[in-house]
């Protein structure tokens, strides 16, 4: 049951009036003022954007509405020398070439600044090779080509399927395996789902469409020239060759018809498994090289894109609270697109606007919540979370000391099967009670709550009559929030099914084709997907913000903590002869875990018995609540990650999108039996065991009773 | 503490065939590549063969291939390499080795091969 | 298949000299090089790998550097139970793994 404080208001100013006042209709107007541009990072149809969005949340009835700028390193093709890629035979003659741009989807023919494809922060380079076909370019594809099949990818150029993980983990590994160009594009067997048409008479993905991105390996560090610093006026920049993340050989994305033609060449081995084969009509062959009558010819990339710093521009809205104005709780999102943002940013973005009105009619009426709610329209995402990172490192010890939680905004829809929600397990029990106070906007679900139809289509695979929520990866703003500050997090949006539809995302992620009427007209012609999804944003913003003792359950954090404990426990038996030979114990960490649940059901025992009307006594308890996040930070950050802080979870190494828990001794497990030195490879695993279980024992303490 | 420990090292006539075997202890066997190295008397270091964790995949020097096999027994943590057609210039100190990324990391005390006319 | 050559064959220095030990490799191996210690009537024993890497137990006097297709193993300050055979072996393209042919290193 949902606990509201009416503050200096009439009752009926509630939750229920926040949500009543949410309307479709809006959130469809504002996606379609938001998307008929392109607004990508860095450009002046961005900051107009920006601008207006300020305007706007100034009338709606914030407090206030500031533009908070940065300088930051931005990537971009050149417009008089574009990128492509050649087959080119013995002579160097370019005997076929990638296309230079996507055909444009009907009634955009004519608009400008549309960014060509390219895989943002790329080096310069015109390398020549034979091609390897790693498939997704993951960890496990080129352990598979290196370690069974001896194919070496020393100096080729390797060609990648996008999906699976992180784009920029695929480089990352090309790069590994020393390869000096990857050519990454979107297979129909991932962007192209049965029985439904491509872009326009579909959600699908057009031969000719291509999905744009960076390729950065930030692991949270922000602006690439002032890793833990804002990229201020004042600011020291490094040298481009000390730039944290930049990818040191050639990238480019190319749609399935450019990918064909390369691929129907290929020679050398044969695909491994069917694992490795597509839906286009090709081998798969890995090569290396093109096969018989092609042998002599040669695959070239021609890339001219430039580094630019650039002046980016977030928005951030302030509405008050009545009661605890220095508690924080933020509902972030970005603005900028790679082209039209469609989906990505602009579903989001719409239904930010109108929780943002919603809450703004509120005060108008004289209403306040009890702590703060910052409102904050990101730039800069699509180039590797920046926005949201220079206001966090610029604003790190306000947020530190007062962030309660993050509400992250992104892409409101990723499909319309059901909900997906991520989120720290303190916010487990906050989500479960609203979507049980939500109507489900599914089909044969009319008059049930959310919470039934989530659970029934997504069911948790540990508890059943209970939906699955997954963990924070990264990849979003919430990034720097919760990885590095160490602030209770969560996001939530409709997704596809998971189960029937295996494609990698959505078809038309970051192409062209991500526009007004792909939303309008196939995902959410209603909006009423979209307006389940406000309803969820808002009203745990709302909860977070307005009710008397934080709606966090340290309970839920016991609960998953055993369960990661047994989980790398298991992971580290598989050497179970090592581990005797070099003493390696969990003990410690297992009885770090048992403190906690024990010491958190006595917390939790006290937070339903203590004085409430004590504000010293509500103070101490909501900030024992609070602080249990940061309580998982360690400042010395993780290894070679030093802005991934959080001990419990950390995007996976091996895919940013990901989430591992305790990835400490994760990384320091994997692969360990390939570590040229086991006894210092297993020192380290009993160095990370150390760090867990000193680390889970005194966020323990934090909920000890004060004295 | 990781031991590997080679046995069936002995004189043997050219034509002639032999099995070395080696016990592993200390390490998860079955989580590692083996191989065998030799080496002739005075004389540098020669691989001879690997094999897969899983014993799926094998590995030969040219000058071995086709008659020498190895082979193992995850259960018993055990490496085998079984020789036939045995050659005067096969006459070494034969290494059982644990090699991890293609370094050798661990070695047996080795067991001498003499093959003789 | 990658070849690789050790020089000198053989060397002489007195304890608390230093030396250095070079070998080449007949394309570029990056860093995949290793060197290993050899004693008379025992097995080889790991010191360096990918080049600069200091097995766990290997005291500090010895380090290894080079990248592509020259490397070295420096022994700075010899100590009695130094005077070995030293081996390199290239780790990048494999089958088969390869080894150089051996540099002894005698008392004076």
């Known amino acids: 049951k949902s606990s509201n404080e009416a503050t200096n208001i009439t009752p009926k100013h509630n939750m229920k009036a926040f949500l009543d006042e949410l309307k479709a209709e809006n959130i469809k107007k504002f996606l379609y003022n938001f998307t008929q541009i392109p607004h990508l990072a860095g450009t002046e149809q961005n900051f107009q954007l920006a601008k207006q969005i300020q305007s706007q949340w100034k009338e709606f009835g914030l407090d206030s509405v500031e533009l908070a700028h940065y300088d930051v390193l931005l990537s971009y093709p050149n417009k008089t020398h574009p990128n492509y890629i050649s087959i080119i035979n013995e002579d160097g003659n370019e005997i076929f070439n990638t296309s230079l741009f996507e055909p444009p989807p009907p009634g955009y023919e004519n608009v400008s600044d549309i960014v060509p494809p390219f895989s943002a922060f790329s080096p310069q380079g015109m390398p020549e090779g034979d091609l390897v076909y790693v498939n997704y370019a993951r960890t496990e594809d080129f352990f598979k080509l290196e370690r069974d099949m001896k194919i070496n990818c020393s100096g080729k150029i390797v060609i990648a399927r996008y999906g699976k993980v992180f784009r920029g983990n695929k480089v990352k590994n090309a790069q590994l395996a020393g390869a000096k160009g990857v050519i990454l594009y979107s297979d129909p067997a991932d962007y192209f789902a049965p029985g439904v048409k491509s872009y326009p008479d579909g959600w699908n993905l057009p031969g000719g469409g291509v999905q744009r991105g960076n390729i950065l390996n930030l692991n949270g560090a922000g602006d690439p020239l002032t890793p833990g610093y804002p990229a201020n006026e004042y600011a020291y920049r490094r040298g481009i060759a000390e730039a944290v993340g930049l990818p040191s050989i050639p990238v480019h994305p190319i749609g399935y018809y450019d990918a064909q033609k390369l691929l129907e060449k290929m020679g050398g081995s044969a695909p491994p498994d069917s694992s490795w084969r597509g839906s286009l009509k090709v081998p798969y062959n890995v090569g290396p090289g093109f096969t018989g009558n092609f042998s002599t010819q040669k695959v070239k990339m021609h890339i001219h894109s430039t580094n630019e710093v650039t002046r980016i521009y977030n928005v951030i809205g302030t509405l008050r609270g009545a009661v605890e104005p220095d508690r924080y709780v933020i509902l972030g999102g970005h603005r900028d697109s790679w082209v039209f943002g469609g989906i990505d940013p602009q579903s989001g973005a719409a239904v930010v606007h109108e929780i943002v009105r919603s809450f703004g009619t509120l005060k108008k009426e004289g209403w306040r919540p009890r702590r703060t709610i910052l409102f904050a329209s990101w730039d800069a995402e699509e180039f590797g979370l920046l926005g949201s990172t220079e206001w966090a490192e610029e604003n790190s010890r306000l947020l530190q000391e007062r962030g309660v939680a993050y509400i992250n905004a992104d892409s409101s829809i990723e499909g319309n099967y059901t909900l997906r929600v991520d989120c720290t397990p303190l916010m487990y029990s906050l989500v479960h009670n609203l979507t049980k106070e939500l109507k489900s906007p599914d089909e044969g679900f009319e008059g049930k709550s959310l919470y039934e139809s989530w659970t029934k289509k997504s069911p948790s695979p540990e508890f059943s009559g209970m939906p699955r929520i997954s963990k924070l990866g990264s990849g979003n703003d919430f990034e720097v929030f919760f990885q590095r500050l160490g602030i209770a997090s969560g996001r939530a949006r409709y997704t596809k099914n998971w189960e029937t539809n295996k494609f990698s995302g959505y078809p038309l992620y970051h192409s062209v084709y991500e526009t007004y009427e792909l939303v309008e007209k196939f995902y959410d012609p209603m909006f009423k997907y979209h307006l389940t999804v406000a309803q969820v944003r808002g009203g745990m913003v709302f909860e977070l913000a307005n009710s008397i003792v934080l709606p966090f359950d340290c309970r839920d954090y016991a609960v998953v903590l055993r369960k990661y404990a047994d989980k790398i426990y298991s992971i580290s038996m598989k050497h179970p002869q090592e581990m005797k030979t070099y003493s390696v114990s969990f003990d410690s960490l297992f009885s770090a875990v048992k403190n906690f649940t024990e010491i958190a059901s006595k917390f939790s025992e006290r937070l339903q018995d203590f004085d409430k009307s004590n504000p010293i006594v509500l103070r101490m308890m909501n900030d024992q609540l609070m602080f249990l996040e940061r309580a998982f930070i360690d400042p010395l950050g993780l290894p070679d990650r030093p802005f991934y802080r959080h001990v419990i979870y950390a995007p996976s190494s091996h895919n940013k999108y990901a989430g591992e828990s305790f990835p400490g001794i994760y990384d320091a497990l994997f692969d360990i039996e390939s570590k040229v030195d086991p006894s210092k490879a297993w020192g380290e695993v009993k160095r990370q065991i150390y760090v867990a279980a000193f680390t889970v024992q005194a966020a323990a303490e934090t909920l000890s009773e004060v004295a | 503490e990781v031991q590997l420990v080679e046995s069936g090292g002995a004189l043997v006539q050219t034509g002639g065939s032999l099995r070395l075997s080696c016990v592993a202890s200390g390490f998860t066997f079955s989580n590692y590549w083996m191989s065998w190295v030799r080496q002739s008397p005075g004389k540098g270091l020669q691989w001879v063969a690997s094999i897969k964790k899983d014993g799926s995949d094998e590995d030969y020097v040219d000058s071995v291939k086709g008659r020498f096999t190895i082979s193992r027994d995850n259960a018993e943590n055990s490496l085998y390499l079984q020789m036939t057609s045995l050659r005067i210039e096969d006459t070494a100190v034969y290494y059982c080795?644990?090699?991890?990324?293609?370094?050798?990391?661990?070695w047996g005390q080795g067991a001498l091969v003499t093959v003789s006319s | 298949d990658i070849q690789m050559t050790q020089s000198p064959s053989s060397l002489s220095a007195s304890v608390g000299d230093s030396v250095t030990i070079t070998c080449r490799a007949s394309q570029s191996i990056n860093n995949y090089l290793n060197w290993y210690q050899q004693k008379p009537g025992k097995a080889p024993k790991l010191l360096i790998y990918t080049a600069s890497s200091l097995l766990s137990g290997v005291p500090s006097r010895f380090s290894g550097s080079g990248s592509g297709t020259d490397f070295t193993l420096t022994i700075s300050g010899l100590h009695p139970e130094d005077f070995a055979t030293y081996f390199c072996?290239?780790?990048?393209?494999?089958?088969?793994?390869?080894f150089g042919q051996g540099t002894r290193l005698d008392i004076k």
């Open positions: 080795a644990r090699f991890i990324s293609a370094v050798g990391v661990d």
């Open positions: 072996q290239q780790s990048f393209s494999t089958p088969p793994i390869t």
